[in-house]
C-alpha cells in the first residue's frame, strides 16, 4: 500500500471550487460531497454561485469528478498502478484540453490535494471558440451522462501520467456531441509516486436535481473502477 493510499480507507470529504470563463462568460461553481475509494463511489452536489451556469452541467462533469480520480476503486491486483492515491496528500496538478467536435474547447488546470482531512479540487477553466448557438452555449445537451472508459498510461519523463478519452454527450435532437479529452497529471510533491502500466477506469455517472435547491445546481453520483490489467501468472497458479 502506498502512503497516500492509507488516506482513502474510509469516507473522505470533498470540496470543489471552479472559476470559469467561456467565450467571455465568467462563472464560479462550488461543490461538496464525499468519496469512498473502497467502492469507487462519489456523491457530490454543485452550485453555480454566480447565477445561471452559461454552459450545460454535463460538460463540466469530467472537470469536477473525473478530477478526483483518487477515489477510483483499484482492485487488489492493480493497487501498484494507482498513481492518483500515491501522489497524496501533497496531490497532483491535472491539466486538460477538451475539444468539443465542431465547436470550441475547454482548457483546465486543477490542483487536487488534501487540505486538512478534506480532498480539495481547485480548478481554473478557460473556454474559447464556442458557437453562441451551438450545443454548448445553446444549451442543447440532455441532462444525463453516459458510461465511459478513461485510458491511462505512464509519463515517465514528467513523473506522472497521460490520460485520453472521448466523452459522448447526448443532444436533445437524439444525436451525440463528442468531447475529446487530453489529460496530464503531475505530482505536486517530490515524494515517490506509482507509475502505472497501461490500464483504464470504467466510469458510471448519474445526474439528478435536488428538488429543494433554489440555485442552479447539479447532483452527481458516480462509480469508478480500474480495470484492464489481468492477474499475474503466479496469481493464476495459486
Amino acid at each position: 500500500m502506498s502512503k497516500g493510499e492509507e488516506l482513502f480507507t474510509g469516507v473522505v470529504p470533498i470540496l470543489v471550487e471552479l472559476d470559469g470563463d467561456v467565450n467571455g462568460h465568467k462563472f464560479s461553481v462550488s461543490g461538496e460531497g464525499e468519496g469512498d475509494a473502497t467502492y469507487g463511489k462519489l456523491t457530490l452536489k454543485f452550485i453555480c454561485t454566480t447565477g445561471k451556469l452559461p454552459v450545460p452541467w454535463p460538460t463540466l462533469v469530467t472537470t469536477f469528478s473525473y478530477g478526483v480520480q483518487c477515489f477510483s476503486r483499484y482492485p487488489d491486483h492493480m493497487k501498484q498502478h494507482d498513481f492518483f492515491k500515491s501522489a497524496m496528500p501533497e496531490g497532483y496538478v491535472q491539466e486538460r484540453t477538451i475539444f468539443f467536435k465542431d465547436d470550441g474547447n475547454y482548457k483546465t488546470r486543477a490542483e487536487v490535494k488534501f487540505e486538512g482531512d478534506t480532498l480539495v479540487n481547485r480548478i481554473e477553466l478557460k473556454g474559447i471558440d464556442f458557437k453562441e448557438d451551438g450545443n454548448i452555449l445553446g444549451h442543447k445537451l440532455e441532462y444525463n451522462y453516459n458510461s465511459h472508459n478513461v485510458y491511462i498510461m505512464a509519463d515517465k519523463q514528467k513523473n506522472g501520467i497521460k490520460v485520453n478519452f472521448k466523452i459522448r454527450h447526448n443532444i436533445e435532437d437524439g444525436s451525440v456531441q463528442l468531447a475529446d479529452h487530453y489529460q496530464q497529471n503531475t505530482p505536486i510533491g517530490d515524494g515517490p509516486v506509482l507509475l502505472p502500466d497501461n490500464h483504464y477506469l470504467s466510469t458510471q455517472s448519474a445526474l439528478s436535481k435536488d428538488p429543494n435547491e433554489k440555485r442552479d445546481h447539479m447532483v452527481l453520483l458516480e462509480f469508478v473502477t480500474a480495470a484492464g490489467i489481468t492477474h499475474g501468472m503466479d496469481e493464476l497458479y495459486k
Epitope: L15, S30, E32, K45, T49, K214, R215
Partner: nanobody, 119 residues
C-alpha cells in the same frame, strides 16, 4: 453538536426594520435563515457561506434583507428592511458543518428554535 439561539424578533410596522441574531455555540460552516409562515412550508430566505465569499437571497427579499456573519463571535445576522406583511413568519437559523452555501433544508445539520417576526 452546535446549538443555535435566535434573538431579535418582534412586532414591527410595515416598512420598518428588524435585525435578527443567531449565536452558535461553536464554529460552523455555511449559515442561513429560513422562515415558516402558518400553514406553509419552511423556506430558505438568505445565507452566507463559511468562507464569507458567497451570499444568496430568494427573490422576494432581495434588496431588502442582508445576511452577514461574525466568525469571532460565531454569530450570523439577518438585517430586514422595508418589511411587508407577507414577511410575517417564524424565522429559523440553520448551520452546516461544511462551508458551501446550499438552499435546501436537507443540507443543514443544526437548527435553532426560531424567533417570531410579525409585520
Amino acid at each position: 453538536d452546535v446549538q443555535l439561539v435566535e434573538s431579535g424578533g418582534g412586532l414591527v410596522q410595515a416598512g420598518g426594520s428588524l435585525r435578527l441574531s443567531c449565536a452558535a455555540s461553536g464554529p460552523t460552516g455555511a449559515m442561513a435563515w429560513f422562515r415558516q409562515a402558518p400553514g406553509k412550508e419552511r423556506e430558505f430566505v438568505g445565507g452566507i457561506s463559511g468562507s464569507e465569499t458567497d451570499t444568496y437571497y430568494v427573490d422576494s427579499v432581495k434588496g431588502r434583507f442582508t445576511v452577514d456573519r461574525d466568525n469571532v463571535k460565531n454569530t450570523v445576522y439577518l438585517q430586514m428592511n422595508s418589511l411587508k406583511p407577507e414577511d410575517t413568519a417564524v424565522y429559523y437559523c440553520a448551520a452546516r458543518r461544511r462551508i458551501t452555501l446550499f438552499t435546501s433544508r436537507t443540507d443543514y445539520d443544526f437548527w435553532g428554535r426560531g424567533t417570531q417576526v410579525t409585520v
